[in-house]
Amino acid sequence: EGSEREENVEKEGLCNACAWRQNTRYSRIEAIKIQILSKLRLETAPNISKDAIRQLLPRAPPLRELIDQYDVQRDDSSDGSLEDDDYHATTETIITMPTESDFLMQADGKPKCCFFKFSSKIQYNKVVKAQLWIYLRPVKTPTTVFVQILRLIKPMKDGTRYTGIRSLKLDMSPGTGIWQSIDVKTVLQNWLKQPESNLGIEIKALDENGHDLAVTFPGPGEDGLNPFLEVKVTDTPKRSRR
Amino acid sequence: EGSEREENVEKEGLCNACAWRQNTRYSRIEAIKIQILSKLRLETAPNISKDAIRQLLPRAPPLRELIDQYDVQRDDSSDGSLEDDDYHATTETIITMPTESDFLMQADGKPKCCFFKFSSKIQYNKVVKAQLWIYLRPVKTPTTVFVQILRLIKPMKDGTRYTGIRSLKLDMSPGTGIWQSIDVKTVLQNWLKQPESNLGIEIKALDENGHDLAVTFPGPGEDGLNPFLEVKVTDTPKRSRR
Amino acid sequence: DFGLDCDEHSTESRCCRYPLTVDFEAFGWDWIIAPKRYKANYCSGECEFVFLQKYPHTHLVHQANPRGSAGPCCTPTKMSPINMLYFNGKEQIIYGKIPAMVVDRCGCS
Amino acid sequence: DFGLDCDEHSTESRCCRYPLTVDFEAFGWDWIIAPKRYKANYCSGECEFVFLQKYPHTHLVHQANPRGSAGPCCTPTKMSPINMLYFNGKEQIIYGKIPAMVVDRCGCS
């Protein structure tokens, strides 16, 4: 009977240790979750569903590249950099999806693309690269496409509402659609310097028959093909002051 | 009586706290001392007196600059770099004083200058800069000085024991002596690749009358005027492997 | 170079680094695009006076302590960041570096 | 940005950074040419569960603990190096950087 009690005590000890381990593991992970939110300057975890992510997540090369760049952490964790030891996360790339704007309305009241909202935290002089990525739908026959990016401005006396940012001519072959990037660094820097000048842009990609191939509002099966802005910034973390 | 006891207890408490504080302060500093020795890879604190330091410490510009470069820590400690968090100290500059060598003996058995001993830890490809600093005694009249740095080699068939490293001609005005630096990076790198080739060097700085102005063995009032080697290295701390 | 490594079956009582994987998918953090999981690790164990002591900047004596700190304790002495790709809840995807997310080494401090 | 600063007269019981000057001249370390003294600072104080917790990589619960680690403890969460000029006892003067010599911030870990 004594040995049975001993065995029970031992089992109980193991169970306690096990429960304790589970408990501390849970506490540890909870604490890490709090940390991550704090380091990313988020008050709560963004409320976004898997479906919403699937729709929003661009299918474009830069995103694939970012995801492929790491696994995100290899087993060999020390391959990473040495700890620079300031608290908050440093941002390297911001991928911004278009949002709706009052300025960008069609005659029928439907929104037009595209308005990009920027955080006042992005400083214009920290922008290293800014690319507008647009997806051009597949063509059935070889065709030349005229891509035009226009910037919406306050109406001028002659009624002009747009001014050109970039235009390019490219040849498309039948098959799959293509992602095209356009350098918009100067425009973005101006928007950051004068936020009131950011009224939105219009994207046109006309083939020889005048059909618009640019995906601005994704149709069925076009999730992740929205235009988006890829902004690379240098983020030298501020030193903490005491 | 009660209040007196209370007062005593309170005093005792303060004393205890005070003694504890002294004690922990001592412990903390002792631990920091152990740390420093460990980080500098020293088993014990080098046994060197203030007088020996005064004699050895070069009076040359690079040393003053190193001392002035930092306070060594300003009040604003965070002005320093962020912690790279690897354990050991990284070396940036090594100032090496000459030591005696069997090869470098004069006919009368007195040692000649200069033999520099190097740690096998210095890798030749990590050397960024290597300067030999020599002090030239003051002259009474304007004169031209011929500085010659010779490298001691194993005797050749024709009896040659030296080969030139550098020679330069400079004009000296009356007044105080001057420090002159000579680039010896290539020589040092060769010595590091082939340590057996490092037999020493000879320094000559002859004025127009054939007097040697180079301080090789300091006389009275010439402490800190020895020749020395200033070696700047890039020391990328090795990542720890697990 | 200092720092013990252990696993959950280890009998080591001294300060040691143990494995801990944080799995974002497991607790429904779909907003983190990558990584889906990462090895955070943690520190645990007892600290004798000088054992593994890296930063001697905490209390180092086991005596009555007016400020309630209990001598050196087992804590990270080397950490590294991870890169992360995530939605920030404002129609933006951010790629950045988060400092001090992985424990590379533990010691007494 | 986290981290409390206190002095010796402070009544703060929570985890805090306190001043500590290390004076090499005072204990006869003449072989250190510069600095002659430096501000090392130290950490001391009590840790509640989440207070000031920077690195959640140590034990975080106050329960019977098979490995004897007593919950989060007050420890450096940011450190910086100092530059030092010193004799190494081999006829050489070295100028280099010594990591983790100054406590810039304390937290519970």
Epitope: - | I53, P61, R64, E65, D68, Q69, D71, S173, T176 | - | -
Partner: antibody
Framework: QVTLKESGPVLVKPTETLTLTCTVS????????ISWVRQAPGKGLEWVGI???????YYASWAKGRLTISKDTSKNQVVLTMTNMDPVDTATYYC?????????????WGQGTLVTVSS | DIVMTQSPATLSLSPGERATLSCTSS????????LSWFQQKPGQPPKLLIY???TLAYGVPSRFSGSGSGTDFTLTISSLQPEDAATYYC??????????FGQGTKVEIK
């Protein structure tokens, strides 16, 4: 012959910037520290700043933010620039070889140049 | 800030007398000996007399000597000569690129 010679404007208006040049001969600026020291009329010497042999700069605390010292080794010149001049900056400005208080620094001085700050 | 105090402000002595000038620093000079003494005559730049607290500069007469360590230093002129009438300054170095001069002691010959 080893010499140092200061040159620059004699008169500067308040709020203006002072630029002084120290031209050396017989001195190799890549081996020698150069200091600037000033002396207000009837007053004592006041350390201003140094440019080291390797080009590092050290400034007196009162001068930080206003002072810049630079050098052009090929021209044998060291330049002192002080912004936002004030009548209290009226002084004779000297350049000297080496650093007074370190080794035999300050063994050689220029003759000095008197700068008056007045509107 | 560092303060270097020289005393006396003025010293009036006869030729052949011994002059003792004092310099006190508010903090220890670097390595206890980063201190120099300078002589300045009206209309002239300063002249280096002593460095490393006690080392006589090149070409300076041996009647000048320096002593002291840390924060307290003395310049002694063993036998005053008429040409020694001048203002004397001490200069200290503190590491960290910090240097300072004393306010000067004026030596007059009666």
């Amino acid at each position: 012959q080893v010499t140092l010679k200061e040159s620059g404007p004699v008169l500067v208006k308040p709020t203006e910037t002072l630029t002084l040049t120290c031209t050396v001969s017989g001195i190799d600026l890549s081996h020698t520290d150069i200091s600037w020291v000033r002396q207000a009329p009837g007053k004592g010497l006041e350390w201003v700043g140094i440019i080291s042999y390797a080009g590092k700069k050290y400034y007196a605390s009162w001068a930080k933010g206003r002072l810049t010292i630079s050098k052009d080794t090929s021209k044998n010149q060291v330049v002192l620039t002080m912004t936002n001049m004030d009548p209290v900056d009226t002084a004779t400005y000297y350049c000297a070889r080496g650093v007074p208080a370190y080794s035999h620094g300050g063994d050689l001085w220029g003759q000095g140049t008197l700068v008056t700050v007045s509107s | 800030d560092i303060v270097m105090t020289q005393s006396p402000a003025t010293l009036s002595l006869s030729p052949g007398e011994r002059a003792t000038l004092s310099c006190t620093s508010s903090q220890s000079v670097y390595h206890a000996n980063w201190l120099s003494w300078f002589q300045q005559k009206p209309g002239q730049p300063p002249k280096l007399l002593i460095y490393w607290a006690s080392t006589l500069a090149y070409g300076v007469p041996s009647r000048f000597s320096g002593s002291g360590s840390g924060t307290d230093f003395t310049l002694t002129i063993s036998s005053l000569q008429p040409e020694d009438a001048a203002t004397y300054y001490c200069a200290g170095g503190y590491g960290g690129g910090r240097y300072a001069f004393g306010q000067g002691t004026k030596v007059e010959i009666k």
